[in-house]
């Protein structure tokens, strides 16, 4: 139980589009150091959600105060869903490294599933 | 070896309140997901709702929302199930339970029960 | 929620002989990715809390006795015992847990003929 563990507890989230989505991810330990990412999909063709340590998300809001000391939660929201956004989101730990940082662990995925916008 | 020990039996009116205490000990608290169920005289087994403390907020049933508050204390270890309203429909035995995983995979299933607590509602 | 269905809901089998348990889910519960099915077994004695004998359908919990197996996927699952012993009387019952509230089958009964 020492060793970090990235802790995605929903398997699966529904959510009606035009709506936010939680996505819930947290880390058993602060070390190491380094960085938390969020991609959609897995492989080489992930796509980016969320980096903490840089870049812009415009759609993207942490739901805790990612700066707060110690702090294990870097759970995430994505606002205004549309089908496109539909799939497995990944919550992944990055290891500090020169001169790019070394993904460590991730999380077991969460299934993104966007229901019709309510008439 | 983790345990989970619960507070012990509890007699109540109809319209109070009920706290019930879950006490781990062993392994990591804050990453536990503890889930309360309960069960009826002679009956099934009902999920109530869970909490995973790391996070802080709990999950609950339809059925038990706005009646059911589920906390943890991580400085003592320990969960609480409080059920407002009580009425005779409640009096059952409640279990908390620990969901289990392994390393960075989803919960699967409860492998760790508390002995149960027996509540029963009367006038 | 999803709705899981247990049929029999009681079921008496001779020592020795196989007892089959039928668990149903009104929605999948296989967990595309890792293709793993989040549906577990568990054993309830007489005054004790539940015990977990299966998880992802078919794995057996460490110390549970091999003759508890669990097949099935997607919506249809199994438990078998195959060949009942007189400390297997029990109440079993299956729960998905994909999706919460994790709900519970409404429980099976096991007897000895």
């Known amino acids: 139980e020492d060793e970090l563990q990235v802790i995605q507890p929903e398997k699966s989230v529904s959510v009606a589009a035009g709506e936010s989505a939680t996505l819930r991810c947290a880390m058993t330990s602060l070390i190491p150091v380094g960085p938390i990412m969020w991609f959609r999909g897995a492989g080489a063709g992930r796509e980016l959600i969320y980096n903490q340590k840089e870049g812009h998300f415009p759609r993207v809001t942490t739901v805790s105060e990612l700066t707060k000391r110690n702090n294990l939660d870097f759970s995430i929201s994505i606002s205004n869903i549309t089908p496109a956004d539909a799939g497995t989101y990944y919550c992944v730990k990055f290891r500090k490294g020169s001169p790019d940082d070394v993904e460590f662990k991730s999380g077991a995925g969460t299934e993104l599933s966007v229901r019709a916008k309510p008439s | 070896q983790v345990q989970l020990v619960q507070s012990g039996a509890e007699v109540k009116k109809p319209g109070s309140s009920v706290k019930v205490s879950c006490k781990a000990s062993?392994?990591?608290?804050?990453?536990?997901?503890i889930s309360w169920v309960r069960q009826a005289p002679g009956q099934g087994l009902e999920w109530m709702g869970g909490i995973i403390p790391i996070f802080g907020t709990a999950s609950y049933a339809q059925k038990f929302q706005g009646r059911v508050t589920i906390t943890a204390d991580e400085s003592t270890s320990t969960a609480y199930m409080e059920l407002s309203s009580l009425r005779s429909e409640d009096t059952a035995v409640y279990y908390c339970?620990?969901?289990?995983?392994?390393?960075?995979?989803?919960?699967?299933?409860?492998?760790?029960w508390g002995q149960g607590t027996t509540v029963t509602v009367s006038s | 929620d999803i709705v899981m269905t247990q049929s029999p809901d009681s079921l008496a089998v001779s020592l020795g002989e196989r007892a089959t348990i039928n668990c149903k889910s009104s929605q999948s519960v296989l967990f595309s990715s890792n293709n793993k099915n989040y549906l577990a077994w568990y054993q309830q004695k007489p005054g004790q809390p539940p015990k977990l004998l299966i998880y992802?359908?078919?794995t057996r919990e460490s110390g549970v006795p091999d003759r508890f197996s669990g097949s099935g996927s997607g919506t249809d699952f199994t438990l078998t015992i195959s060949s009942l012993q007189a400390e297997d009387v029990a109440v079993y019952y299956c729960q998905q847990h994909y999706i919460a509230p994790f709900t519970f089958g409404g429980g099976t009964k096991v007897e000895i003929k």
């Open positions: 992802w359908a078919s």
């Open positions: 062993g392994g990591t608290f804050s990453s536990y997901a």
């Open positions: 339970a620990r969901e289990t995983r392994q390393d960075s995979a989803h919960y699967y299933g409860m492998d760790v």
